[in-house]
């Protein structure tokens, strides 16, 4: 019996339900009654949903899941997960039998966006050119961890003295807070970006420095 | 009729491997699952794996996990179950059966092959 | 350590009912069917009963099974000295895998 589910991973966003699709091919003459069908998690083995004895045996994952019972006679066996969770990313395996069987396996993949960075500067007045300064970019509960990327305003990358830090909350979902130290010049806008790299959202933050007018000695 | 008859097993060493045969007939082998069931010397059936049709589909006792391996050659009609790493607790008959369907009972079952392991 | 739990005897006189109890929990019993098999001393394992209830062509009618919740039950009524035999119940198990009692000997006084 060919099981078939998405090669690529599901991307479901926090909070939102997600659909893990599986199907298989009913033979002439299928009922329901024949159907065996099992959602597990893969590597702990622990049951999620299952269908046996003509019956929708019910959700054994937190009360989150359903089928969709109107399509289970046409092949369709695919897992309904409400209100997802950081703790529900893994893998899935579907198993089917009716005469024979088969298995496959899903994987959902959990994202959630980065909130738009908040600049704040360190010192934050009196500033002249040749200052050393701290810039720091915070970005709130987003999933997975955020590639942090710093340039100037000519667009330039700034790599060197990069501080990134990141801090799972209760929930799973990421604060992250980036510095970076930088020697000012005359004028200089500082931007940061932090991505998101399942999602490919980028969220943007920047701080314009306006120095008080250059002086030599 | 519907007939499983098997071949492969003996005595080996522990640590030894073996093949274990089972020529099916009868039916057409490649609809249906089939399985493998151990019996220790005066002990209960344990069942070891099972594999789909296709063979594209396997699931092993956790017992036997990573040391068993269940294979099927359908333009045969032959199951196979390769056994490594042997150890003196797998000493046993072992069954080859066909499922009549999935989660419904075994219904055609091979002679027993033994498989004796010791030093 | 069999996952499915069965009493390890039971007897009967010829002509009497015998019934075999097999207890397993919500991820087998409770979610699939329960299959019977009897083995004749010295023979490979026979199915007996299958689908909780449903007896294989060739199976005398004194054979029935029944299932409620998490366990499953085989009654063998009118009792004849060839069921003298072992018997073993098996399922499904929502981890993927099949699970056997620990097996009931059945004697003829």
């Known amino acids: 019996l060919e099981v078939q589910v998405p090669e690529d991973p599901v991307v479901a966003l926090v909070g939102t339900d997600a659909t893990l699709c599986c199907s298989f091919s009913p033979e002439p003459g299928f009922s329901l009654a024949q159907l065996n069908l099992i959602w597990q998690l893969t590597d702990t083995k622990q049951l999620v949903h299952s269908f046996a004895e003509g019956q929708d045996q019910g959700s054994a994952y937190a009360n989150r899941t359903a089928l969709f019972p109107d399509l289970l006679a046409q092949g369709n066996a695919s897992l309904r997960l409400q209100r997802v969770r950081v703790a529900d990313e893994g893998s899935f395996t579907c198993f089917v039998s009716i005469r024979d069987f088969g298995s496959a396996a899903v994987s959902l993949q959990v994202a959630a966006p980065y909130s738009k960075p908040s600049m704040t500067l360190e010192p934050n007045k009196d500033l002249r050119p040749g200052d050393t300064v701290t810039i720091t970019c915070s970005s709130y509960r987003g999933y997975p961890e955020a590639e942090v990327f710093w340039q100037d305003g000519q667009g330039v990358p700034l790599t060197g003295n990069v501080t990134t830090s990141q801090m799972a909350n209760e929930q799973g979902l990421f604060d992250v807070h980036s510095v970076l130290r930088v020697v000012l010049g005359a004028n200089g806008t500082y931007s940061c970006l932090v991505r998101n790299p399942v999602l490919q959202q980028d969220a943007h933050g920047s701080v314009t420095i306006t120095g008080q007018p250059m002086t030599f000695p | 009729q519907v007939q499983l008859q098997q071949s492969g097993g003996g005595l080996v060493q522990p640590g030894g491997s073996l093949r274990l045969s089972c020529a099916a007939s009868?039916?057409?082998?490649?609809?249906?699952?089939m399985s493998w069931v151990r019996q220790a010397p005066g002990k209960g059936l344990e069942w070891v794996s099972v594999?789909?049709?296709?063979?594209?589909?396997?699931f092993y006792a956790d017992s036997v996990k990573g040391r068993f391996t269940i294979s099927r050659d359908n333009s045969k009609n032959t199951l196979y179950l390769q056994v490594n790493s042997l150890r003196a607790e797998d000493t046993a008959v072992y069954y080859c059966a066909k499922d009549g369907r999935t989660l419904s009972g075994m219904d055609v079952w091979g002679q027993g092959t033994t498989v004796t392991v010791s030093s | 350590q069999p996952v499915l739990t069965q009493p390890p005897s039971a007897s009967g006189t010829p002509g009497q009912r015998v019934t075999i109890s097999c207890s397993g929990s919500s991820s087998n019993i409770g979610s699939n069917p329960v299959n019977w098999y009897q083995q004749l001393p010295g023979t490979a394992p026979k199915l007996l009963i299958y689908n909780n209830n449903q007896r294989p062509s060739g199976v005398p009618d004194r054979f029935s099974g029944s299932k409620s919740g998490t366990s499953g039950s085989l009654a063998i009524s009118g009792l004849q000295s060839e069921d003298e035999a072992h018997y073993y119940c098996a399922a499904w198990d929502v981890s993927l895998k099949e699970v056997f009692g620990g097996g009931t000997k059945v004697t003829v006084l």
């Open positions: 009868g039916f057409t082998f490649s609809s249906y699952p």
């Open positions: 594999i789909s049709g296709s063979g594209g589909s396997t």
